[in-house]
Interface confidence: medium
Amino acid sequence: SERCDDWGLDTMRQIQVFEDEPARIKCPLFEHFLKFNYSTAHSAGLTLIWYWTRQDRDLEEPINFRLPENRISKEKDVLWFRPTLLNDTGNYTCMLRNTTYCSKVAFPLEVVQKDSCFNSPMKLPVHKLYIEYGIQRITCPNVDGYFPSSVKPTITWYMGCYKIQNFNNVIPEGMNLSFLIALISNNGNYTCVVTYPENGRTFHLTRTLTVKVVGSPKNAVPPVIHSPNDHVVYEKEPGEELLIPCTVYFSFLMDSRNEVWWTIDGKKPDDITIDVTINESISHSRTEDETRTQILSIKKVTSEDLKRSYVCHARSAKGEVAKAAKVKQKVPAPRYTVELACGFGAT
C-alpha cells in the first residue's frame, strides 16, 4: 500500500477501561497529532478506519463491527464498546485516509477487572483538597458523552468499599461530592458509579479517584529556614570535615516550585574551585508540607574556607529567604609542653 504518515504507538495515552462497562475512545489523531478536527476531515472526503492488534499478537486485524447488539461500533471519531470484554485488550489503530492522504496512530487499550471494593490495577487520578478550607467538591470524571442530557442517571458515591449515605462532612450531590470541611480522615479513594439506561439495557460507569488533603493556602507561609541558625556555630580546625545542613520548611502550595541552594562567598558552589559536595533529602508531612535538607560538605576544610561566607537560600511561590551559617576556625588549645615550659620561665 502507499506511504502513510505513521505516528507510531502513542504510549502517552495508555487507556484503561473497566471490564463489562461502556467505553468511548476518541481517535487521538484529531486531539494530538493533526491540526484539523474530524468534521473538517470528513467534509474533505477523508475516511476514518479502525483496526487492532490483540494482546501478545503481531497481526493487525479489522475490528468486527457486526457483533450482537452492536457491542463495538464507531460514531464519528469515537470507537464505542457497549460494553467491553477482557479480551478487547490490545493496541488499537485509527487511520485517516483517502486516495492521496494517509495518517495513522496506534494506542494501547487495557481492559481491567475490579473487585467488589473497586480495587484494580487502574491508575487513579489524584484530586487535592485544601485542609479545613470551606466547601470543596470533587466531580465524577470522564462521564461526558456517554448519555444524552435528557437521560437522568443514578449516581452512587463510595469511599473505599462503603456507600456514602451521608457522612457528617461529605454530601453527595449527583455527579459532585461536596466536602463541607476536608480533613486528613477524608484521604482515600472515592468511587462514583453512574447507572444509565440505553436501548432497554442498563449500563454502569465506574470512576475512582484518590483524594489527598493538603495544606491550605490560608495557612501558607514563606519558606522557613530552621538551619543554619544563630544558635549553632560551625567551629572547625583546618583539615577537618565541614558539614552544614540547610533545613527548610515549605508550606504546601499548589504548583509551587520549592528551591533550596547554597552560595559560598555569593557564588553557587559549581562556580568556585573548592571541593564541595551537596546532598539533598526531602520529606513530606501528611498535608504535603515539605522539608528539604541540603547538606554542604567540604571533606578537608582549609583556613581559607573557614573565612568564607556560607549562605543557605530558599524560594517558593510565597517568597525568598536566606540565612548565613556561623563558621569559624577553632583556636587550637595551647600544647601542654609549651605551657609548662613557659611556667618555668623558659624562653
Epitope: 485542609i131 479545613e132 470551606g134 466547601i135 470543596q136 467538591r137 462503603y162 456514602i164 449515605q165 451521608n166 457522612f167 457528617n168 462532612n169 454530601i171 453527595p172 450531590e173 449527583g174 461536596s178 463541607l180 470541611i181 480533613l183 480522615s185
Partner: antibody, heavy 127, light 114 residues
C-alpha cells in the same frame, strides 16, 4: 447522649431590643472533641423551624450561616469544654423564638447534621 | 438560596390510614433531604435522612421517597401517637468564593389523627 442548652438566665432569656445574649450547648455522654458539627435552629412561637448556622467543633471551627443572619449572630466553640455557643446581637422582637442546638450523627457513615437535639431555650426580646 | 415548600397543611387521617406529605425544593438537592417529627413542647426528632433512609429507632411505618426537587413522606398504618407537625429539611451546597451551605426547612405539615 444528649445536648444540654444553657443561656438566657433565670428569666428564661428576656432581652431588651438592641441587646445581646449568648446561648451555649454542652455535650454530655460524649465528647465534642471527637469533632462534630453543631447546628442552631430557631422556632418563633407557633411558627416553623428556621436554620441559623452550623459550626465544626474541631481544630478549624469552620462555620456556615444562613444568609439572613447578616453578621448579627456568631457561632463559636470550646473544644475542651465540649461546647458550642451562639452569640445573639442587635436583637429585635422578630428574634423572639425557641433556639435549639442540634448535633450531627455519631458515626461518619450515618451522620446527619441534625440527628440529636437540645431541649431548646426560649429567648424573648421585649422592652 | 434554597426554598422548601411543604404541602398540604393540615392533613387529617384515621387510625390505620395512610398519610402522604409532599416537599418541593427550589433547587436540585439530589437525595439530600431529611424529615423530622415535632410534638408540642418538644424538639424535633429525626425520622428519615438521605430522602429514604430510616433513622435509628424509627418505626418502619414511616418511609421517604423522591430525589431532585420532589420528595414524599408516607406514614402507613397511622397511629394516634403520630399526631404531630412534620418538617422536611433540604441540604444544598453552593460553591462560591467562600463556599456556602444552605439548610432550609419546609413550612411544616400538621397531621391530625382522628
Amino acid at each position: 447522649q444528649q445536648l444540654e442548652q444553657s443561656g438566657g438566665g433565670a428569666e428564661g432569656g428576656l432581652v431588651k431590643p438592641g441587646g445581646s445574649l449568648e446561648l451555649c450547648c454542652k455535650a454530655s455522654g460524649f465528647s465534642l472533641s471527637n469533632s462534630y458539627w453543631i447546628c442552631w435552629v430557631r422556632q418563633a412561637p407557633g411558627k416553623g423551624l428556621e436554620w441559623i448556622g452550623c459550626i465544626y467543633v474541631g481544630s478549624s471551627g469552620s462555620t456556615y450561616y444562613a444568609s439572613w443572619v447578616n453578621g448579627r449572630f456568631t457561632l463559636s466553640r470550646d473544644i475542651d469544654q465540649s461546647t458550642g455557643c451562639l452569640q445573639l446581637n442587635s436583637l429585635t422582637a422578630a428574634d423572639t423564638a425557641i433556639y435549639y442546638c442540634a448535633r450531627d450523627g455519631a458515626t461518619s457513615t450515618s451522620g446527619h447534621l441534625f440527628e440529636l437535639w437540645g431541649q431548646g431555650t426560649l429567648v424573648t426580646v421585649s422592652s | 438560596a434554597l426554598v422548601m415548600t411543604q404541602t398540604p397543611s393540615p392533613v387529617s387521617a384515621a387510625v390505620g390510614g395512610t398519610v402522604t406529605i409532599n416537599c418541593q425544593a427550589s433547587e436540585d438537592i439530589y437525595s439530600n433531604l431529611a424529615w423530622f417529627q415535632q410534638k408540642p413542647g418538644q424538639p424535633p426528632k429525626l425520622l428519615i435522612y438521605r430522602a429514604s433512609t430510616l433513622a435509628s429507632g424509627v418505626p418502619s411505618r414511616f418511609s421517604g421517597s423522591g430525589s431532585g426537587t420532589e420528595f414524599t413522606l408516607t406514614i402507613s398504618g397511622v397511629q394516634s401517637d403520630d399526631a404531630a407537625t412534620y418538617y422536611c429539611l433540604g441540604i444544598y451546597t453552593y460553591i462560591s468564593a467562600d463556599g456556602s451551605l444552605y439548610n432550609a426547612f419546609g413550612g411544616g405539615t400538621e397531621v391530625v389523627v382522628k
